[in-house]
């Protein structure tokens, strides 16, 4: 019947994403349980999209390499409830790569999955961005006004925050 | 890790055809979206096609519109450039590309999202 071919397919799904990520969790969205939305355990979610904290300390470039070969990227932030999310699973004396970066040193900033840069959904710390030089973006914590976006030298290695659309099943 | 392997290059005349293929080591080929780019002397490297994972949605650079198509066989684990009226601004070499993809529909058009990188393969158009 269909409830048995749709379970046989998505435990069929389930086993062929193993090899990227050997655990998913799953959820039912809504009332159909035909629509099951997962992200990689110990990935966080958040609306549509998955989240993982990624502890190593690398260049933007290699957090960026890493992120995509989990077939994600270096996080796009698209709205305050986002970064309100986001924090809650950062470390204050730390500071984290996003997917925001100036290649040509400009100020033109623009995020890595090409979704346009407004500046009026920035959180840039007061006087940020000021080098040139400075052409990726981070995220940290300053006492004065908490959790906000600063310019750094890209080949500085860093945390993360890698970010994927959910997988649905 | 996924291992690339291009062919297909040459030297050509303007307006002839040449095929590029791209093929992967990765068995399950068909949850890698793919693109290809180009670098020509003295330039950066240049986005120019790419495809889904499920081959139904595609994208290319402005230039190339019209001229050139990109397709996949997931069977054969290959990708494919299909590049007619060939001009010779299309000089350089050409790489594929590939990234892990959990949807059928998503497009990477940009370099740092693809980890996976093929060595190259040289096409040279002359007037």
């Known amino acids: 019947n269909f409830m048995y071919s749709k379970t046989v397919k998505r435990l069929s799904k389930l086993r062929e994403y193993q090899q990227y990520h050997p655990s998913l969790t799953c959820v039912m969205e809504g009332k159909d349980i035909e629509d099951w939305s997962c992200c990689p355990t110990p990935w966080t979610s958040f609306q549509s999209s998955c989240y993982f904290i990624s502890t190593g300390m690398q260049s933007w470039t290699k957090s960026q390499k890493n992120c995509s070969v989990m077939g994600a990227d270096l996080v796009v932030i698209n709205t305050r409830e986002e970064q309100d999310f986001i924090i809650q699973n950062l470390k204050r004396n730390s500071s984290y790569f996003l997917g925001l970066s100036d290649p040509g040193g400009r100020r033109h900033w623009q995020w890595v999955d090409q979704t346009p840069y407004n500046e009026n959904v920035t959180f840039w710390h007061s006087g940020e961005p000021n080098n040139l030089d400075e052409r990726c973006a981070i995220i940290n914590f300053r006492s004065s006004e908490e959790w906000g976006w600063n310019d750094i030298h890209c080949h500085v290695p860093q945390k993360s925050i890698c970010k994927m659309k959910k997988i649905y099943i | 890790q996924v291992q690339l392997q291009e062919s297909g290059g040459g030297l050509v005349q303007a307006g002839d055809s040449l095929r590029l293929s791209c093929t992967a080591s990765?068995?399950?080929?068909?949850?890698?979206?793919m693109g290809w780019f180009r670098l020509a002397p003295g330039k950066e490297r240049k986005f120019v096609a790419a495809i889904s994972t499920s081959g139904g949605t595609t994208d290319y650079v402005d230039s190339v519109k019209g001229r050139f198509t990109i397709s996949r066989d997931n069977a054969k684990n290959t990708v494919y450039l299909q590049m007619n009226s060939l001009k010779p601004e299309d000089t350089a070499v050409y790489y594929c590309a590939a990234r892990l993809d959990f949807s059928s529909t998503d497009l990477y058009t940009t370099a740092p999202r693809y980890p996976y990188w093929g060595q190259g393969t040289q096409v040279t158009v002359s007037s």
């Open positions: 990765e068995r399950t080929f068909s949850n890698y979206a």
